[in-house]
């Protein structure tokens, strides 16, 4: 079967939106009026993995683009990267752990843990303009609450 | 074309048991992750349990853990939802659905599903 995806936008607690910066790099930031079509479309995909009420397993992928967000340890440090891959193969249902974020949902927001990394998440600065990246805390001066936004197709 | 016939339904005192069946044709039954959705009188769809293809894999809602067992036979083509101590609030149309899959605790996509089958719990 093939796996299934949707599209959606994906904006921090502070209402911050997430945009390209370079060619591998997302940053947050505030965006209004027509500035949001800046804003980065994900493809979603559901992907097999660790299930329960609050968790469901997925991958993100950026809309028509052959990246995924993936994590991977670099310098002995848990990060965040937007990682290229072959689109003939790409989404599926079995993706690499690194690829897998557990999507958490708490009170009508979004966490979203890395699945390789258990308790580190995909966070965003309080301030303005700077990169996302992949934290290991929550509830600090750092943001890993997010809401999603359904995108059609 | 898909095809998914959902039988077992009834009545059934608070306390009792049901089997739920779902006989599917029209698509490869093995490969799909399946699933079962409710909708109570006057209420909206929720989501009840999904089971993955192969079967290794089942997930269920807070509301019916430890009561309700989904499985597959895929040699048969069929789903089933093992309904134990079932209670007034389960009272609901069932449904079967294919290539079920849960976007959030309120949503979900799937691609078919069945005419549903009446589960009444009543004394």
């Known amino acids: 079967a093939p796996v299934r995806s949707l599209n959606c936008t994906l904006r921090d607690s502070q209402q911050k939106s997430l945009v390209m910066s370079g060619p591998y790099e997302l940053k947050a930031l505030h965006l209004q009026g027509q500035d949001m079509e800046q804003q980065v479309v994900f493809s979603m995909s559901f992907v097999q993995g660790e299930e329960s009420n609050d968790k469901i397993p997925v991958a993100l992928g950026l809309k028509e683009k052959n990246l995924y967000l993936s994590c991977v340890l670099k310098d002995d440090k848990p990060t965040l990267q937007l990682e290229s891959v072959d689109p003939k193969n790409y989404p599926k249902k079995k993706m690499e752990k690194r690829f897998v974020f557990n999507k958490i949902e708490i009170n009508n927001k979004l966490e979203f843990e890395s699945a390789q990394f258990p308790n580190w998440y995909i966070s965003t600065s309080q301030a303005e303009n700077m990169p996302v990246f992949l934290g290991g805390t929550k509830g600090g001066q750092d943001i890993t609450d997010f809401t999603m936004q359904f995108v059609s197709s | 074309e898909v095809q998914l016939l959902e039988s077992g339904g009834g009545l059934v005192q608070p306390g009792g048991s049901l089997r739920l069946s779902c006989a599917a044709s029209?698509?490869?039954?093995?490969?799909?992750?399946m699933g079962w959705v409710r909708q109570a009188p006057g209420k909206g769809l929720e989501w009840v349990s999904s089971i993955s293809a192969m079967g290794n894999r089942t997930y269920y809602a807070d509301s019916v853990k430890g009561r309700f067992t989904i499985s597959r036979d895929d040699s048969k083509n069929t789903l089933y939802l093992q309904m134990n101590s079932l209670r007034a609030e389960d009272t609901a149309v069932y449904y079967c659905?294919?290539?079920?899959?849960?976007?959030?605790?309120?949503?979900?996509?799937?691609?078919?599903w069945g005419q549903g089958t009446l589960v009444t719990v009543s004394s």
């Open positions: 659905a294919e290539n079920l899959v849960r976007v959030s605790k309120a949503r979900w996509m799937f691609d078919y």
């Open positions: 029209g698509f490869t039954f093995e490969d799909y992750q």
